[in-house]
Interface confidence: medium
């Protein structure tokens, strides 16, 4: 008879800029109506109101208008809260408090995360290097959360721990930029790798630089961008890195910098006549004005959308000119799949059931894999459909038709091919006759 309020034991991990669902369910008694329900979501520590339902209606968000309930599911005991455009400041514990005649509450932890960008590597000095020279290699990775772990190694995979200085600085959004500096004496040639690990996402971002000491030609404007695509999560900010080599005596009055879409040559952002001319791209771009004089022409693209995906050209002219194109690969993680069974009652071995695995709001299109409890792939009788919404994010629905054995586990894995992120759900069907979901 008691009112049981249930939340996940494990923290909900949410990527900055994405939406998170804080699951909470209660057990309504027969005859329960929403008019009886008081539902409060609040911050556990401060008791600050986040969202509420009372007097038979949703009383709305008290938390920056970024929360929503699932009104159609409340009557079935689903008191889950959707938190939109997650920020670092949202991290913490949220209490779901339900009162009808009885009351109950439970707290769910939100762990916020943001993947670190592929590190950029800079060398100082970066010209006229000879064996025996001491160089400073800087590995910079941006906009991650929580703080990163940084590892250096040489070309043979041997860890480099001496002469490493790592600093991490949080920006206004609470995201960390990590800068790790390795001081090393050059050999005849050498490869130096930097790995930036996000401890929550278990995501590794790495880059390496190979130094072959020799004289390099001078005079030309060398414009450098990352070879690999920049991967940015929908809703987050991305930095399209571009650098050039200013000559001695260079001043910003001499600089023409143009960022444009490679294919259409549509202007994105520009710097000329000694000043930033601003964004021509939906007011979502910015340069790093304090760094331009040192040859940093990188572009910041805010609140990334699926439509931003593509190639951007960084064009620099001083006296000479040069350009390079950098690819932006947009991504969004797929939600943990929800599993449904049809039919879902009185199941017996030999029955044919349809198991649907649904995962939402990912990009690009997912790869879906099914397997049984022994890890054996299930490829027959699988139909997968993917539909893009207005923002270009995909909802994936994969349907497996299977004949039940005495019991069995069926797992669905939804893979984001860009993020190499796997989201999986499984359903175990046992006993006879049986019902899904299992009744409490």
């Amino acid at each position: 008879g008691a009112l049981e309020v249930q939340v996940p034991e494990d923290p909900v991990v949410a990527l900055v800029g994405t939406d998170a669902t804080l699951c909470c369910s209660f057990s309504p008694e027969p005859g329960f109506s929403l008019a009886q329900l008081n539902l409060i979501w609040q911050l556990t520590d401060t008791k600050q109101l986040v969202h509420s339902f009372a007097e038979g209606q949703d009383q709305g968000s008290a938390y920056a208008n970024r929360t929503a309930l699932f009104p159609d599911l409340l009557a079935q005991g689903n008191a889950s809260l959707r938190l939109q455009r997650v920020r670092v400041a949202d991290e913490g514990s949220f209490t779901c408090f339900v009162s009808i005649r009885d009351f109950g509450s439970a707290a769910v932890s939100l762990q916020v995360a943001a993947p670190y960008s592929k590190p950029s590597m800079t060398l100082e000095p970066n010209k006229d290097l000879r064996p025996g020279d001491t160089v400073t290699i800087t590995c910079s990775s941006y906009q991650g959360y929580p703080e990163a772990e940084v590892f250096w190694q040489d070309g043979q995979g041997v860890p480099l721990t001496g002469n490493v200085t790592t600093s991490q600085m949080a920006n206004e959004q609470g995201l960390f930029d990590v800068h790790s500096i390795l001081r090393v004496v050059l050999g005849a040639n050498g490869t130096y790798s930097c790995l930036v690990r996000n401890p929550v996402l278990q995501q590794d971002a790495h880059s390496s630089v190979t130094i072959t000491p020799q004289r390099s030609p001078t005079g030309a404007v060398e414009v450098q961008v990352p070879e690999d695509p920049v991967v940015a999560l929908v809703g987050t900010d991305a930095t399209l890195r571009c650098s050039f080599s200013p000559e001695p005596g260079f001043s910003l009055a001499q600089l023409n910098l143009i960022w444009q879409l490679t294919d259409t040559k549509q202007l994105v952002h520009s710097f000329t006549e000694g000043r930033d001319q601003g964004s021509a791209y939906a007011n979502r771009t910015a340069l790093f004005p304090d760094l331009l004089a040192q040859g940093n022409a990188s572009l910041r693209l805010q609140r990334v959308r699926v439509a931003d995906e593509g190639s951007f050209t960084c064009f620099v002219s001083i006296r000479d000119f040069g350009s390079a194109a950098v690819s932006l690969q947009v991504a969004a993680p797929y939600s943990k799949p929800s599993m449904t069974l049809e039919p879902n009652k009185d199941l017996r071995p030999g029955d044919t059931v349809t198991i649907t695995c649904s995962s939402y709001r990912g990009y690009p299109e997912a790869e879906v894999f099914w397997q049984d409890g022994q890890g054996v792939p299930l490829t027959g009788n699988v139909t997968t459909s993917q539909m893009a919404n207005e923002q270009g994010l995909f909802d994936v629905h994969s349907v497996l038709r299977v004949v039940l054995g005495a019991n069995g586990t069926y797992s669905c894995l939804v893979r984001n091919p860009v993020l190499q992120q796997d989201a999986h759900g499984s359903v175990t069907i046992t006993g006879q006759p049986m019902t899904f979901p299992p009744e409490a």
């Epitope: 008879g1 008691a2 009112l3 049981e4 309020v5 009886q36 008081n38 409060i40 609040q42 008791k47 109101l49 509420s52 009372a54 007097e55 009383q59 209490t95 408090f97 009162s99 009808i100 005649r101 009885d102 009351f103 109950g104 509450s105």
Partner: antibody, heavy 119, light 108 residues
């Protein structure tokens, strides 16, 4: 008929402990949340603790947090309030109440039991 | 926690008078409010629940109104047995659900 009967009150020295009981009858005790409300002499009402029907959720007023523990034994139809580290300001009549559907207030109260904390 | 402020703290009135007691919450409590009457040496008695609903057995001269943060208890025509202390209590959010400080209604 719903009945709530408190017991266990009395005189206790500062720093001492006391356990109040509330025997419930006339309704299905295990289906209702319960609360303890106190009233110091000549003062207003203060809800000091509440517990849900299976004892899984408990709440306390800041003034008693860490010192008082509310609990229940549904098999015995009894509600308890364990009070320790008692202070003079805990002197009050303690009422046991039954929580209705929350919008419906506290419809049923016991007669109260007096706790006096004094040296 | 939500604070409940009741006014006035005391009130003198005569039999037959119309009396109004107000209760203000420190934040929106969405009509989750009850009113109680307490006589000396007795336990409180529930009069009104959900801001405006009359508890069974309570005379119809008692009524409640309000929404958001401001609520009112009205006694349309005072009877001798109505002289007592009145309390409001909210039931919004997590416990403890606090009471107002009380209004003592005395005979003029």
């Amino acid at each position: 008929e719903v009945q709530l009967v408190e017991s266990g009150g009395g005189l206790v020295q500062p720093g001492g402990s006391l356990r109040l009981s509330c025997a419930a009858s006339g309704f299905t005790f295990s289906s209702y949340a319960m609360s303890w409300v106190r009233q110091a002499p000549g003062k207003g009402l203060e809800l000091v603790a509440a517990i849900n029907s299976n004892g899984g959720s408990t709440y306390y007023a800041d003034s008693v947090k860490g010192r008082f523990t509310i609990s229940r034994d549904n098999a015995k139809n009894t509600l308890y309030l364990q009070m320790s580290s008692l202070r003079a300001e805990d002197t009050a009549v303690y009422y046991c109440t039954r929580n209705e559907e929350f919008r419906r207030g506290l419809a049923y109260w016991g007669q109260g039991t007096l706790v006096t904390v004094s040296s | 926690d939500i604070q409940m402020t009741q006014s006035p703290s005391s009130l003198s009135a005569s039999v037959g008078d119309r009396v109004t007691i107000t209760c203000r919450a420190s934040e929106n409590i969405y009509s989750n409010l009850a009113w109680y009457q307490q006589k000396p040496g007795k336990a409180p008695k529930l009069l009104i629940y959900a801001a405006s609903n009359l508890q069974s057995g309570v005379p119809s001269r008692f009524s409640g109104s309000g929404s958001g943060t401001d609520y009112t208890l009205t006694i349309s025509s005072l009877q001798p047995e109505d002289f007592a202390t009145y309390y409001c209590q909210h039931f919004w959010g997590t416990p403890p659900w606090t009471f107002g400080q009380g209004t003592k209604l005395e005979i003029k």
